[in-house]
Structures are given as C-alpha cells and as structure tokens.
C-alpha cells in the first residue's frame, strides 16, 4: 500500500526509539570508519525530518524514498573521500545505482580497533551518566564492525545489553553478575552475525531462488504439521524481510519482521503447535523466540514420498506444468519428514532430483529413467553422517583445542595462501562444532553440525573475497551454494604451492604471551602453527605435534621464569633451532 | 473466500457403492493436503482418509481402509472418495476439508449425507 511519505510510515509504524535506533545501525553498517558523534547528529537530523513529515506528509522532500533520504544524508559527510577513498564516488550516481554502490562497500572485515572492555565501574558509572548514548554506542560499534547484522535482531540484543547492565550495576558483586552475561551476548552476537552474514551471501551471490529453497526445507523441518501452503506463504515473507535487511532497508525489514511475527502468532494452530510461549512475549523476543523454536512433531501417517515423486504415472507433467513448484513441493515433503538430515543436504537432494527429471522427462521412457532416482540419495546422504562420525570421533579424542589444532593444520595444506589470520579464525569456528554438536544424539547431529559449518565457511568465503588469493576457495565458494562443505572437504594438500620463506621473527614470543587470556594465548599458538605449516607444508601430524608440544613447555617455562624476558629471548632462540632441525628446515 | 462443495451422497443399500466429490475454490488447492471426515448422527467428527499435495500419497481410518478410495484432480481443483462395500455404520455426513490429518476444526461445507439402509 503506497504512502505519501515513506519516512512518516515508518516513523509512525515503529515508533522513535526503534526508528532511531535502526537509523542509526543502517548508518554505520554503511560508513563503518565515521566517528559515533557524527553519526548521532545525522541520525538527529534524519529524525527530526521524520517528525515534520510525521505532522504534515505533504511538507518538503517528504515523498522521497529513504534511499534517497539517507543516502543523501551519508553523502554530506565532509571527510567522504579522505576516509574511504573509491566509496566517495556513489555520491555521484543517483538511487538505486547510489545505494547499490554503498552496499558494495560494506567491509566484512573493516580496519578497526579490538573491542576492548573497560572494568566493570567504569562501565557502570558510564551506564548510569548516560544510559541512551551508551546504548546508542553499543548499536554503533557492533553494526560497524558487523556491516551485515540482522538490525531487528540487534535491537534485541540492545535490549539485552540494557538489562544486564539495570541488573548488575546494582548487585553486590557487579562483575560476577556482569561479566558472564556480556560474554554470553559476545558470543550470541558472533554467532548471529554469521548465520545472517550467510543468508545476505545466499541472497546476493545465488539470488532469491537458492535462498527461497533453504527457507522451505527449514521452515518445513521446523513447522512440519503446516500446509504446503502456509510454508510457501511464510517463505515469500521471510525472504522479503531478509532481502530488505541485507539490502540495507532496515526500517522496512524491521517493519515487516514484526508484521511476519504477528501473522505467525495469530495463525499458530495452522504453523505448529510450539510457538504458544514465544507468542506470550513483548515484540523483540517474540520475533526472536519464533526464529529459534524446536521443531515441531511430524504429523502422523505420512504416505511414501516414492508415491508422489517416483511411482506416480503424472511425475513429468506436474514437473513441466510448474517446475518450481513441483520442485518446492518435494523439498517440503522431504524436509517435514527429515528433521534429522542438515538443510544442505536436503537441497543437494532437490537439486540431484532437478537433474534427474531435466533428463528423464525427455527420454523416451521417463519412468523407467526416473524409477531408481532415491537410489542416487544415498551416497548423499552417508557421506556428511559418515564425516561427522569420523570429526566426532577425533573431537572426543582430543578436545577442543587440539581438535581446532587439527583443522588448522588440515586447512593450511589445503588452502596455505590464505591469510594466516583468516585461517586460524575459520580453523577455530570449524573446531567449535565439535562442543557445539557432537554431544546431540545421531538425530540432531547432522542439521547441527553441517548447517553450521555452512555458515563458518560462508565466513571463509566473504573474508578471501575481499582479497582474493587461492583459486581453490574462490571455486568452492562459488560454483554451488550447497556444496561448498563438501567441495573443502574434498580439497587435498595443494601440491603447487611453494612453502613461505622462514622468519625468525614470526617465531619470536615475548613476556606479554603470559598475561593474555586462555583463549588469546591458544590464538597465538595457532598462529604459530599456521605459520609452520606455510613453512613446511609436508610436515607430518607427529612432526607438528612435538613442535607444539615443545612450544608449549618453554611459554610455560618462560612463564614462571623469574626474568620472563631474557628466558623468552634465550630460550626462543633454541626453540626455533630445534623446531627447525626438527621439520628439516 | 475458501469455499468446499461436496456432493454425490445418497441412499445406498450395504454392499453397495458411491462417489463423492469435493470442488474446492478461493485457494491454491494444489498447495494443500485434502481430508475427508465425517459426523455419524449424534457423534463427533471422524477423520476419514487424507490425500498428498499431488494425490500419490493416501492414508486411510481402519475402519475404512480396503473400502474406501480417496483421489484427487488438481487441474479440476477437485477431490473424490469412492466407498465401496458400504456398511450401515458409514451413515453419516461427509465433508471435505483442508490439511493432512486435521485435528484442528477447520471451516467445513455443507456436506454430502450418506445413508446405508436396507
């Protein structure tokens, strides 16, 4: 339904707070360097325009859509040029190329400072001077440094962050109340950046249709009792409201989730019959709770799929009549019955059945050519439960840290151009699944575990786009959406690499390693041992781990030593010589 | 507006056969799973049979099961249900409605009323 004016819709629909919260995220996901102040005063303007359109819709430049009302905005930033070279030039094309041109820019991975946290007085007398800025900076620092986050999402986790802090400022141990709480959100947040990170990716690398496919086989496992109907209905709302965010119109993504929400809420007894406690919540949770709710129960007595897909007489003409459709409804129907089985494969399923009736519907005995079909599903279908069983086995067998440890080395050999940096997070992420998943039973297993590794190669593929260095991720992460998990693990040591130069220098650790945390110390290990396989990329597993180990002894050596320094120095030096006769280099 | 027609019911002597048919329209029928279920006099509704969004999958009640035989046209946007060897306990009023296995209430037609009587 069109409005006059598209900023007092919106300003009305969602209220100021919200509206300027979501400004605010929309701003500095797209001018990731700009100072917060700056930012605060062009959301101060944006909104007090909105009011005067709020009272008059017919008042000055009220028509104009909010691309042209925010880009315009972003485009008085005096210092454009100076702190983003090349970005500067979208001010000189007109809407859509302009916001088309901003969204090109968004950096996944922008040069800016760690967050580090201050204690925890200091955060609350902050907190308490000035509640709205200091919220308004924690929406600024994380939508900078994650240009693609789901902005409703992020409001919720606002919301979140404000209570932890009403709550624990005034507890009697403020940092043990605070702290685990603000780590918890850390780590949600990450998690949430990435899996929205790969819907963006799915959208604007593989189009609508290859993210409106995940969302029928997800939403079918999850609502398995819904029609085909009500899924299909859910599934062209969902991919507006993630076109829309990933697109940078995130008041009319956040508009039209709570639209989604309700709709869900007041058609529940057709969706799933888990959705009552999450439709009892306030707006951000709701929306939220409704995103992560279990799977329902299958409904009972569902017939053969061979029966509609196979040994049905009519398979080509359905197919032909409306192949998308056709299609969407075998996903549906092997979705709601597979809650056991990753997005992913489900897709590769639909795909490999795609193929199978192109071929078959144009031989001259489509049945006979299409009567094995379920037959090709099953090597599909053993090769991740066979390569989760195998990682689970090796996770049990080493931990976390020594299981990251493995994948680090794995991927190295398969991918050493990538940044070291890179790999060391990616090799962590893809560590991560093994505390993550392999404690479910064999029923939830696969949907955790390659679903989630989807989404930290997704992270792999945005970060080596940016800079693009092996031909082999670029093809793994480009040829198919799918089969991207198997396309690496099918990746063997790259025989034409030329192993990097040795450097002292890399291998060079001083009394600061004994004051970081656990887990920075683990990164620097990991950083380490990335840099010895460049150096020595045939290195065998026996090899690296005396290295390691070796490694290990002298920081913790050096650690207790009475002059950390000079035992960092001394001691370092006969490490690398060691290490080097060791590898042979 | 959903709207679900039934008819083809009657009277029909035990052992003997019927036809029924539903034509659906206000929706995407092809979209949904089809039921059929039915409320003998003075009793509660009854699921019947169900039918797969293409019509290749079927379930069917046990006590018609072997009997009964649920199909679908979806270019015809109609749904049928042939009782053969029908017993005086299929008395009842048989209405067509949306979704597999429904056992939510959903809007029901006026229905078709079948009568096995000797």
């Known amino acids: 339904d069109a409005h006059k004016s598209e900023v007092a819709h919106r300003f009305k629909d969602l209220g100021e707070e919200n509206f300027k919260a979501l400004v605010l995220i929309a701003f500095a996901q797209y001018l990731q360097q700009c100072p917060f102040e700056d930012h605060v005063k062009l959301v101060n303007e944006v909104t007090e325009f909105a009011k005067t359109c709020v009272a008059d819709e017919s008042a000055e430049n009220c028509d104009k859509s909010l691309h042209t009302l925010f880009g315009d905005k972003l485009c008085t930033v005096a210092t454009l040029r100076e702190t983003y070279g090349e970005m500067a030039d979208c001010c000189a094309k007109q809407e859509p190329e302009r916001n088309e041109c901003f969204l090109q820019h968004k950096d996944d991975n922008p040069n800016l400072p760690r967050l580090v946290r201050p204690e925890v007085d200091v955060m609350c007398t902050a907190f308490h001077d000035n509640e709205e800025t200091f919220l308004k900076k924690y929406l600024y620092e994380i939508a900078r440094r994650h240009p693609y986050f789901y902005a409703p999402e992020l409001l919720f986790f606002a919301k979140r962050y404000k209570a932890a802090f009403t709550e624990c400022c005034q507890a009697a141990d403020k940092a043990a109340c605070l702290l685990p709480k603000l780590d918890e959100l850390r780590d949600e947040g990450k998690a949430s950046s990435a899996k929205q990170r790969l819907k963006c990716a799915s959208l604007q690398k593989f189009g609508e249709r290859a993210f409106k496919a995940w969302a029928v086989a997800r939403l079918s496992q999850r609502f398995p009792k819904a029609e085909f109907a009500e899924v299909s209905k859910l599934v062209t709302d969902l991919t507006k409201v993630h076109t829309e965010c990933c697109h940078g119109d995130l008041l009319e993504c956040a508009d039209d989730r709570a639209d989604l929400a309700k709709y869900i809420c007041e058609n529940q007894d057709s969706i799933s019959s888990k959705l009552k406690e999450c439709c009892e919540k306030p707006l951000l949770e709701k929306s939220h709770c409704i995103a992560e709710v279990e799977n329902d129960e299958m409904p009972a007595d569902l017939p053969s799929l061979a029966a509609d897909f196979v040994e049905s007489k009519d398979v080509c003409k359905n197919y032909a009549e409306a192949k998308d459709v056709f299609l969407g409804m075998f996903l549906y129907e092997y979705a709601r019955r597979h809650p056991d089985y990753s997005v992913v494969l489900l897709l590769r399923l639909a795909k490999t059945y795609e193929t199978t009736l192109e071929k078959c519907c144009a031989a001259a005995d489509p049945h006979e050519c299409y009567a094995k079909v379920f037959d090709e599903f099953k090597p599909l279908v053993e090769e991740p439960q066979n390569l989760i069983k195998q990682n689970c086995e090796l996770f049990e067998q080493l931990g976390e840290y020594k299981f990251q440890n493995a994948l680090l080395v794995r991927y190295t050999k398969k991918v050493p151009q990538v940044s070291t940096p890179t790999l060391v997070e990616v090799s962590r992420n893809l560590g991560k699944v093994g505390s993550k998943c392999c404690k479910h039973p064999e029923a939830k297993r696969m949907p955790c575990a390659e679903d989630y590794l989807s989404v930290v190669l997704n992270q792999l593929c945005v970060l080596h786009e940016k800079t693009p260095v092996s031909d082999r991720v670029t093809k793994c992460c480009t040829e198919s959406l799918v089969n991207r998990r198997p396309c690496f693990s099918a990746l063997e040591v790259d025989e034409t690499y030329v192993p990097k130069e040795f450097n002292a220098e890399t291998f060079t650790f001083h009394a600061d390693i004994c004051t970081l945390s656990e887990k920075e110390r683990q990164i620097k290990k990991q950083t380490a041992l990335v840099e010895l396989v460049k150096h020595k990329p045939k290195a065998t597993k026996e090899q690296l781990k005396a290295v390691m180990d070796d490694f290990a002894a002298f920081v913790e050596k050096c650690c207790k030593a009475d002059d950390k320094e000079t035992c960092f120095a001394e001691e370092g030096k006969k490490l690398v010589a060691a290490s080097q006769a060791a590898l042979g280099l | 507006e959903v709207q679900l027609q039934e008819s083809g019911g009657g009277l029909v002597e035990p052992g003997g056969s019927l036809r029924l048919s539903c034509v659906a329209s206000g929706f995407t029928f092809q979209h949904y799973a089809m039921s059929w279920v039915r409320q003998a006099p003075g009793k509660g509704l009854e699921w019947v049979s169900s039918?797969?969004?293409?019509?290749?999958?079927?379930s069917y009640a046990d006590s018609v099961k072997g009997r009964f035989t649920m199909s679908r046209d979806n270019a015809k946007n109609t749904l049928y249900l042939q009782l053969n060897s029908l017993k005086s306990e299929d008395t009842a009023m048989y209405y067509c409605v949306r979704g597999w296995h429904p056992d939510v209430p959903r809007p029901l037609g006026q229905g078709t009323l079948v009568t096995v009587s000797s």
């Open positions: 039918i797969s969004l293409v019509g290749g999958g079927t």
